[in-house]
Interface confidence: low
């Protein structure tokens, strides 16, 4: 019995309530499609945001803020952003074979809407992506990496002070607005009620205003979308930028894969791996007979000590080898006994 499934586009449930992209950057938009049989085509279309604007005078439903009709093929990018559509990839995601189509915007120069449409013999599915381009403000993370629980992180919102005023930090509420099939998320600047205003500190230099929002001892509850809003000094138009913050959970070290007992002949090589995970990342150390293994020309440790090579093994290399991975959250270890067979040649090596 074959159950046919019309194309379902996976990102819909993950869609962010705003998509704001910095001017001039290269961006990749993705459509992940599940369908049985697989889609015979996935096509991309676009149109300018201004041709599809959410003006109060227009009859627009709350759930569909963009009444878009005139979609153009991405092959015709005249007046829009230069585009390249990559060849479809196939991936096993959540146990299902899915088709992934990616569209690369070479330089984000104009605000536009993009639609991917997937068709198979039993139906079609589509996803509309709001691609709003902003020349500012700009969000940066200090330090520029995902924080781990209990670490501190600052979100910096930088805007040209000759262009923008009234910088404000918000956090999106945990419940995103409901999104219906084929519809766009409501732009965040038009939905300030869904945001929590945050305390922040303002700094200025000769050209920029910088609004810094500090998270001391970040927790998993601090994860989410942070919005910086700035107002154009002349037009008073609001500009919003969103940065998703992920806080990594602290995880004690674990070692994956087994270190196995092995028997090797004199003169051969032994290569073993010890892969550890954890957060913060653990340091790997090797021991032989409970003493730290010293690297020399015959013993090579590589890739952050993950890989141990013993070249030209000798009888004295026999013993109990331990890989230990440690972090502030503790240690994990695995052990194996290496047996060396054969007679030792005489050597005058140092």
């Amino acid at each position: 019995l074959v159950v046919y499934v019309p194309p379902q586009i996976g990102e819909k449930s993950l869609i962010s309530p705003v998509d704001s992209y910095q001017y001039g950057t290269t961006q990749t938009l993705t459509c992940t499609v599940y369908a049985i049989p697989p889609p015979h085509h996935i096509h991309w279309y676009w149109q300018l945001e201004e041709e599809c604007a959410n003006e109060p005078s227009q009859a627009v439903s709350v759930t569909n803020p963009y009444p878009c009709e005139e979609w153009r093929s991405v092959e015709d990018f005249q007046g829009g952003n230069k585009i390249e559509v990559n060849k479809n990839q196939f991936a096993l995601i959540e146990g299902k074979n899915k088709t992934v189509s990616t569209l690369v915007i070479q330089a984000a120069n104009v605000s536009a809407l993009y639609k991917c449409e997937a068709v198979n013999k039993v139906g079609r599915g589509e996803r509309v992506i709001s691609f709003h381009v902003t020349r500012g403000p700009e969000i940066t993370l200090q330090p520029d990496m995902q924080p781990t629980e209990q670490e501190s992180v600052s979100l910096w919102c930088t805007a040209d002070r000759s262009t923008f005023e009234n910088l404000t930090w918000y956090k999106l509420g945990p419940q995103p607005l409901p999104i219906h099939v084929g519809e766009l998320p409501t732009p965040v600047c038009k939905n300030l009620d869904t945001l929590w205003k945050l305390n922040a500190t303002m700094f200025s230099n000769s050209t920029n205003d910088i609004l810094i929002m500090e998270l001391k001892n970040a927790s998993l509850q601090d994860q989410g979308d942070y919005v910086c809003l700035a107002q154009d000094r002349k037009t008073k138009k609001r500009h919003c930028v969103v940065r998703q913050l992920t806080v990594l959970e602290r995880v004690a070290p674990t070692i994956t894969g087994n270190l196995e007992n092995q028997t090797t002949s004199i003169g051969e090589s032994i290569e073993v791996s010890c892969t550890a995970s954890g957060n913060p990342p653990p340091q790997i150390m090797w021991f032989k007979d409970n003493e730290t293994l010293v690297e020399d020309s015959g013993i090579v440790l590589k890739d952050g000590n993950r890989n141990l090579t013993i070249r030209r093994v000798r009888k004295e290399d026999e013993g109990l080898y331990t890989c230990q991975a440690c972090s502030v959250l503790g240690c994990a270890k695995v052990e194996a006994f290496f047996i060396i067979e054969g007679a030792q040649e005489k050597t005058n090596l140092e």
Epitope: E295, S297, G298, L301, G304, L349, E350
Partner: antibody
Framework: QVQLQQSGPELVKPGASVKVSCKAS????????MYWVKQSHGKSLEWIGY????????SYKQKFKGKATLTVDKSSSTAFMHLNSLTSEDSAVYYC??????????WGQGTSVTVSS | DIQMIQSPSSLSASLGDTITITCHAS??????LSWYQQKPGNIPKLLIY???NLHTGVPSRFSGSGSGTGFTLTISSLQPEDIATYYC?????????FGAGTKLELK
């Protein structure tokens, strides 16, 4: 890209000591040994020793034991070689080089040490 | 210490020639041999490691072969930028040791 930036030339008197630095960038400093090599004017290359920045483990060629001391500062990804009791025999260009198992895949620009009264 | 004997100590060749430099180890070093190029006034540069592996960015006209005690560096179709001194180095055991070098000149 991998870079090893060494300190500038040294002109020292006999009996004095000198410390040559080698700042590494473009790779994980603690993952690879740092080798030091001497090249006297017009001569071949001579291995002095190595230091493993991960655990400060060192190995020296016999003739350089007591002459050279190798250290590292992990926080700044910098390796150091301290040369003491200098004589004219120690006048040479000294290189640091990133270890790649048994080879040296990237070299500093060299530090010229001249011992002269 | 393992001695590395390089030959010839100097070599004159013409552009486009294929040249070979040999390196002999005083004891078995398996494949733990590297070759370096040093141009006048410049730093040594790794060409070949583990006897025959070309280091990143090194032109394919350079090749290495050998194992045990005998090793060869070959440069096919000599170019003007290949004029330099070439050194071999063993990595079998500490202390690491270098050959005395082969100075390559143009005829």
């Amino acid at each position: 890209q991998v870079q090893l930036q060494q300190s500038g030339p040294e002109l020292v008197k006999p009996g004095a000591s000198v410390k040559v630095s080698c700042k590494a960038s473009g790779y994980s400093f603690t993952d690879y040994s740092m080798y030091w090599v001497k090249q006297s004017h017009g001569k071949s290359l001579e291995w002095i020793g190595y230091i493993d920045p991960y655990n400060d483990d060192t190995s020296y060629k016999q003739k350089f034991k007591g002459k050279a001391t190798l250290t590292v500062d992990k926080s700044s990804s910098t390796a150091f070689m301290h040369l003491n009791s200098l004589t004219s025999e120690d006048s040479a260009v000294y290189y640091c080089a990133k270890g790649y198992a048994d080879a040296m895949d990237y070299w500093g620009q060299g530090t010229s040490v001249t011992v002269s009264s | 210490d393992i001695q590395m004997i390089q030959s010839p100590s100097s070599l004159s060749a013409s552009l486009g020639d294929t040249i070979t430099i040999t390196c002999h180890a005083s004891q078995n070093i398996n494949v733990w041999l590297s070759w370096y190029q040093q141009k006048p006034g410049n730093i040594p540069k790794l060409l070949i490691y583990k006897a025959s592996n070309l280091h990143t960015g090194v032109p394919s006209r350079f090749s290495g072969s050998g194992s045990g005690t005998g090793f060869t560096l070959t440069i096919s179709s000599l170019q003007p930028e290949d004029i330099a001194t070439y050194y071999c180095q063993q990595g079998q055991s500490y202390p690491l040791t270098f050959g005395a070098g082969t100075k390559l000149e143009l005829k």
